[in-house]
């Protein structure tokens, strides 16, 4: 906390300029008018204020705007944003995408900080939904952003926004998140033809149900093993050997290398061994020939 002291004669700042870097911290406090600072915030970034001088400037803005900064000031915070706490940011009402971009630019190249997470949260809540332009912006700065959201938060993503999503944006999503995103992606891409559709939907298939996988198996999509391994186990189990063969196409040979890993392992256990043998891959662990398989879950559903 800087003491309140009178500004020395002739040192009162008439504008925010580089001469201020040679002021002592108490002189900045005493000689820089907070309202002047607020109107000339865009200049601060171009002036090499020290780490602690920026604390003084922040303190002045905090006194001027105890209820939170107006967006006209927020948009020009620049590196002063790094001095803000999540508590400060919770007082803000950020509605402009330009403001959001300007502040994300300051943090570019760094991990998402608590400040940035709070800023994004405030922005998205203010907008009511995660629209395409916002999602475009956020995933450009933070590819893992989408997967940091809860399934509940993801439910506010409109299908039209899915066009902004790149495969790498989904790398860290878990099945619960893909369960929410997949139906939106299916809706978003529904008017595309077979091969184009598969290219777009592929990253989201970790949320696909069995019937959709069966439908894909009829379209010669040649799904790669990496995608297959990310499918929901419960969606893969009911697929027949013939359906998996059609789904994977030439990639079916990769099943051998994955036979001990889910979902391949669990799927093998559900197939008849003689069906598995037709693949000629040496997959073992299927149901021996002559055994009857009772689907108890179906029986329970009927009773």
């Amino acid at each position: 906390e800087v003491e309140k002291t009178a500004c020395p004669s002739g040192k009162k700042a008439r504008e925010i300029d580089e001469s201020l870097i040679f002021y002592k911290k108490w002189e900045l406090e005493a000689c820089v008018d907070a309202a002047l600072l607020a109107t000339q915030m865009d200049r601060v970034n171009a002036i090499p204020f020290t780490y602690e001088q920026l604390d003084v400037l922040k303190h002045k803005l905090d006194e001027l705007y105890p209820q939170g900064y107006p967006e006209s000031v927020i948009q020009h915070l620049g590196y002063l944003f790094l001095k803000m706490s999540p508590e400060d940011i919770r007082k803000w009402n950020v509605t402009s995408l330009e403001t959001l971009k300007a502040l994300l630019e300051v943090n570019k190249g760094h991990e998402m900080s608590p400040q940035v997470a709070t800023l994004i949260d405030r922005f998205v809540k203010g907008r009511g939904q995660l629209d395409k332009d916002t999602l475009d912006t956020l995933t450009a700065f933070y590819p893992g952003y989408l997967c940091s959201l809860s399934p509940e938060e993801l439910s506010s993503v409109p299908p039209s926004s899915i066009w902004a999503v790149r495969p790498q944006d989904l790398d860290t999503c878990d099945p619960r998140q893909l369960d929410v995103l997949y139906p939106k992606a299916r809706l978003a891409f529904q008017n595309m033809n077979g091969s184009e559709y598969f290219v777009k939907i592929q990253s989201f298939l970790g949320g696909a149900p069995t019937e959709d996988l069966k439908a894909l198996s009829q379209q010669n999509v040649s799904m790669d093993l990496a995608t297959f391994m990310k499918l929901r186990t419960d969606a893969v189990l009911p697929l027949t050997v013939a359906e998996v063969q059609k789904l994977l196409g030439p990639h079916v040979e990769g099943l051998k290398a994955e036979e001990r890993h889910r979902p391949v392992r669990d799927w093998i256990l559900r197939q008849r061994q003689d069906d598995l043998d037709t693949l000629g891959l040496g997959l073992q662990g299927g149901i021996p020939n002559g055994y009857l398989v009772l689907d108890l879950s179906m029986q329970e559903a009927l009773s």
């Epitope: 002021y23 970034n45 020290t50």
Partner: nanobody
């Protein structure tokens, strides 16, 4: 213990160039602004150029604008001053400084390196 060690000074003819370096050790200087000051014989030490702790914003004294360029390499913890079109008036001991707080009283100083520009 924090140390700022300057190098690159020397004797150069008017119109020539020099590049000063300042190697910082003993701590991480990521939140420190860094700068170059100089002191000519019989004169006070004066700021030459300053670079921000983040973002690369700079300050130059009017007398060196357009001739000198300050830069820093965060990975190497090193500050540079590229001096072109040198004049006899640039003759001085050049000091590297680092501060988190105030340029009127920097936290750390180097020992200085002599630059002499002959006419």
């Amino acid at each position: 213990q924090v140390q700022l060690v300057e190098s690159g000074g020397g004797l150069v003819p008017a119109g020539g160039s020099l590049r000063l370096s300042c190697a910082a050790s003993g701590r991480t200087f990521s939140t420190y602004s860094m700068g170059w000051f100089r002191q000519a014989p019989g004169k006070e030490r004066e700021p030459v150029a300053v670079i921000s702790w983040i973002g690369g914003s700079t300050y130059y004294a009017d007398s060196v604008k357009g001739r000198f360029t300050i830069s820093r390499d965060y990975a190497k913890n090193t500050l540079y001053l590229q001096m072109n079109s040198l004049k006899p008036a640039d003759t001085a001991v050049y000091y590297c400084a680092a501060t988190k707080s105030e340029w009127r009283d920097p936290d750390y100083w180097g020992q200085g390196t002599q630059v002499t520009v002959s006419s």
